[in-house]
């Protein structure tokens, strides 16, 4: 018996087609992805093959103005239109709190939404009961397939799930659910979830009875043969893991942003054992036409977005200096504003020992593309912010050793004075440079804001300590020459859309007046 698994993950609000780098589509003839194009390909496969499942491994939420405006209603609407068979909850599904998941998505989805390792407690338990499930048994042709879901146990540090959801260890939580499926005579089981490729592989190895793992969170691109676009494969598709009980378990993921549709063909024997697996992600490029009815629906929903982008988010009573003459040479108040917003967006009261789990932000000055003039009645709109942050990136959470941070700050000024983009703006950091010294040895003071303290204060950077830092995904990926970050990061979790982070902060503060306050000094 043969099963075709079509899968997406980490779509992050890319409902419309995008450029090759998943930013806003500029030249339509070279654009990719989007739900209208995805629908065309899915329907084509459904017509051609008998046993097809369309699965999503989480993080549909967060990433473009679509999510900012529609807050998840767009996800439910278009996933329903594409007739997804199941979805696993990702960490970003909790970005607007549990209510922001329940109302727009859980109550509106016509497909099961899954996670076995999220347990509700207190008053939420009855409210959310039945709206998401640990597993679902789906009829596919003459057979049944069990889908069991999982979500990153780090979600409380990455999003806003509140205090009434407990995120258990994935493997510990999955095993009893898989065992339950076995007792129900379900012998073909897919683990669908959002914890990252390393955890996906562990699930394949450790959870007895899981036949296939369909994952997300780490934006992992797997491919067999010559890849069709710019993404470099992390391994073959599918990635085969030998389980502790000796089975060959295929593990797949389909990069991110709806650029690819994962396509995996599995052959099972009559006892539900995987005999063979093969496939590849399908690049959703312009050779695949956008479905006209879905496209028309997208255009209808788009109207509200255009209106939103000119509405006032808040006011500034000071000039927001985002000029390259400032932000690439010295501390600039636009950099301070953005970093403050980045930290504010990551406030998660950890416990009595920590006022927050993260206190530091770094931001390449070259990523700040425009100032905002306060003389336009102080009005700040989404459109203004899109000029400041035009690249459609995310602000991510990483863990770095102090020694890596030191290298990053040396890199920040290694060729100072040439208006290059690597000059770092900061939050929760006080740095002093001495430009009379040789490159690589210009950082003379580097103090960082404590997290394990009731009254935050600045302490010298410790080289061997591990620090959490919020930074643009561009830097996490080694952009602007920050190769040391990419090479030495100990953990990387994708965050929220950059403009959304700043717009939310401005809306919350109502009136802003960021200053230049001595975060960056020269001796």
């Amino acid at each position: 018996w043969e099963l075709t698994i079509l899968h997406t993950n980490d779509v992050h609000s890319r409902l419309e087609q995008t450029s090759e780098d998943s930013s806003k589509c500029v030249n339509a003839s070279r654009c990719m992805g989007g739900v209208a194009r995805l629908f065309t390909k899915v329907q084509q496969i459904r017509r051609a093959e008998p046993n097809v499942l369309l699965l999503d491994a989480g993080d549909q939420y967060q990433g473009t103005i679509w999510f900012t405006v529609y807050k998840g209603a767009e996800v439910a609407h278009f996933m329903n239109a594409l007739r997804y068979d199941a979805m696993a909850l990702g960490n970003h599904e909790f970005d607007n709190g549990v209510e922001g998941l329940i109302e727009p998505l859980l109550k509106e989805a016509k497909f099961p939404i899954l996670s076995a390792n999220i347990k509700a407690k207190g008053p939420l338990a009855s409210q959310i009961s039945g709206l998401y499930l640990p597993y679902k048994v789906l009829p596919v042709g003459d057979e049944v397939v069990g889908i069991v879901g999982y979500t990153s146990k780090e979600t409380p540090f990455l999003s806003n799930p509140g205090t009434n959801l407990v995120f258990e260890d994935e493997i510990t939580a999955l095993q009893p659910e898989v065992d339950k499926l076995k007792t129900l005579n379900v012998n073909k089981i897919i683990a669908l979830g959002h914890s990252g490729f390393e955890t996906d592989k562990l699930i394949a190895q450790k959870v007895r009875g899981v036949d296939v793992v369909v994952g997300g969170h780490s934006n992992t691109f797997l491919y067999t043969g010559n890849p069709p676009s710019k993404e470099v494969p992390a391994g073959k598709y599918p990635f085969i893991v030998t389980s502790d009980d000796g089975r060959k378990v295929p593990v797949v993921q389909a990069y991110a942003f709806g650029k690819y549709l994962g396509y995996l063909k599995i052959e099972f024997d009559e006892r539900g054992n995987v005999i063979s697996s093969h496939g590849n992600p399908i690049l959703l490029n312009s050779s695949i036409p956008e479905d006209p009815s879905i496209k028309a629906d997208i255009n209808k929903w788009r109207i509200k977005l255009d209106n939103y982008s000119t509405q006032e988010l808040g006011k500034t009573i000071v000039y927001l200096d985002g000029s390259s003459q400032s932000c690439r040479f010295r501390e600039c108040n636009m950099g301070n504003l953005i970093c403050d917003a980045m930290i504010n967006n990551n406030l998660r009261h950890a416990d009595e020992m920590f006022w927050n789990h993260v206190s530091m932000c770094i931001l390449n000055g070259g990523g700040i593309r425009s100032p905002i003039d306060e003389r336009n009645n102080g009005t700040i709109t989404w459109e203004n912010l899109a000029a400041v942050l035009p690249f459609g990136g995310t602000f991510d959470l990483v863990q770095l050793k102090g020694s890596t941070l030191k290298k990053a700050f040396e890199h920040s000024v290694h060729r100072y004075g040439q208006s290059t983009g690597e000059f770092l703006q900061v939050g929760g950091i006080h740095v002093v440079y001495d430009l009379s010294r040789k490159p690589g040895d210009r950082v003379v003071k580097l103090d960082v804001l404590c997290t394990k303290c009731r009254v935050p204060s600045y302490d010298p950077l410790k080289m061997d300590e591990i620090y959490k830092v919020i930074l643009p995904n561009f830097l996490a990926n080694g952009g602007d020459g920050f190769q040391m970050i990419k090479d030495e990061l100990l953990r990387h979790d994708s965050g929220d859309q950059d403009i959304n982070v700043v717009s939310t902060y401005i809306s919350k503060m109502k009136v802003i007046y960021p200053a230049v306050e001595g975060r960056i000094k020269f001796s």
């Epitope: 040789k438 950082v443 010298p460 410790k462 080289m463 061997d464």
Partner: antibody, heavy 120, light 107 residues
Framework: EVQLVESGGGLVQPGRSLRLSCVAS????????MHWVRQAPGKGLEWVSG????????GYADSVKGRFTISRDNAKNSLYLQMNSLRAEDTAFYYC?????????????WGQGTLVTVSS | DIQMTQSPSSLSASVGDRVTITCRAS??????LAWFQQKPGKAPKSLIY???SLQSGVPSKFSGSGSGTDFTLTISSLQPEDFATYYC?????????FGGGTKVEIK
């Protein structure tokens, strides 16, 4: 576990030279600034010299400037102090100490010291 | 050069006493001050950095405070193993300089 082991001390006549070595283990040597600090018998501590991770920044106490040279070999996890034109007042225990990310950071770990005696 | 003046130069105290040592810099050094403990025949041991931050592994009976020019090291309840000489040191600017030391003896 961080370990710093000094060697090269001994009895030397005034005007002569001596080279002290310090071998480090238990940490990534080329991430850290390193220092020499000395202590004359029964006296207090005196900073002698410091060197940044890549030898880009070097500092000396006025009392040794022009006579002592600090250096490091990151490949060998070693710190050195070349002491020329030694004087009786250079007699002291010489300690190697680990700094932080730059020279102007706190000293954290210290070696057990090596005794230099300058006497005729 | 920045002069570091420690006081007292010596003190006698009993087990269980609260002991305070002060250190004054000849000019402002922000919080770039460290405290060390040294026992006879041993290398100095780092206790406090950045004026008030405890080095890992150092018991919480030791605390530091101050900023600018005036700093204190406090031992909340003196124990037999705390009888030693204590030094302050500034690392705000070259040359790094130490205080003259405070010898804590048994009364």
């Amino acid at each position: 576990e961080v370990q710093l082991v000094e060697s090269g001390g001994g009895l030397v006549q005034p005007g002569r030279s001596l080279r002290l070595s310090c071998v480090a283990s238990g940490f990534t040597f080329d991430d850290y600034a390193m220092h020499w600090v000395r202590q004359a018998p029964g006296k207090g501590l005196e900073w002698v010299s410091g060197i940044s991770w890549n030898s880009g920044s070097i500092g000396y106490a006025d009392s040794v400037k022009g006579r002592f040279t600090i250096s490091r070999d990151n490949a060998k996890n070693s710190l050195y102090l070349q002491m020329n034109s030694l004087r009786a007042e250079d007699t002291a225990f010489y300690y190697c100490a680990q700094g932080g990310y730059a020279i102007l950071t706190a000293l954290e770990y210290w070696g057990q010291g090596t005794l230099v005696t300058v006497s005729s | 050069d920045i002069q570091m003046t420690q006081s007292p130069s010596s003190l006698s105290a009993s087990v269980g006493d609260r002991v305070t040592i002060t250190c004054r810099a000849s000019q402002g050094i922000s919080n770039y001050l460290a405290w060390f403990q040294q026992k006879p025949g041993k290398a100095p041991k780092s206790l406090i950095y950045a004026a008030s931050s405890l080095q890992s592994g150092v018991p919480s009976k030791f605390s530091g405070s101050g900023s600018g020019t005036d700093f204190t090291l406090t031992i909340s309840s003196l124990q037999p193993e705390d009888f030693a000489t204590y030094y302050c040191q500034q690392y705000n600017s070259y040359p790094l300089t130490f205080g003259g030391g405070t010898k804590v003896e048994i009364k």
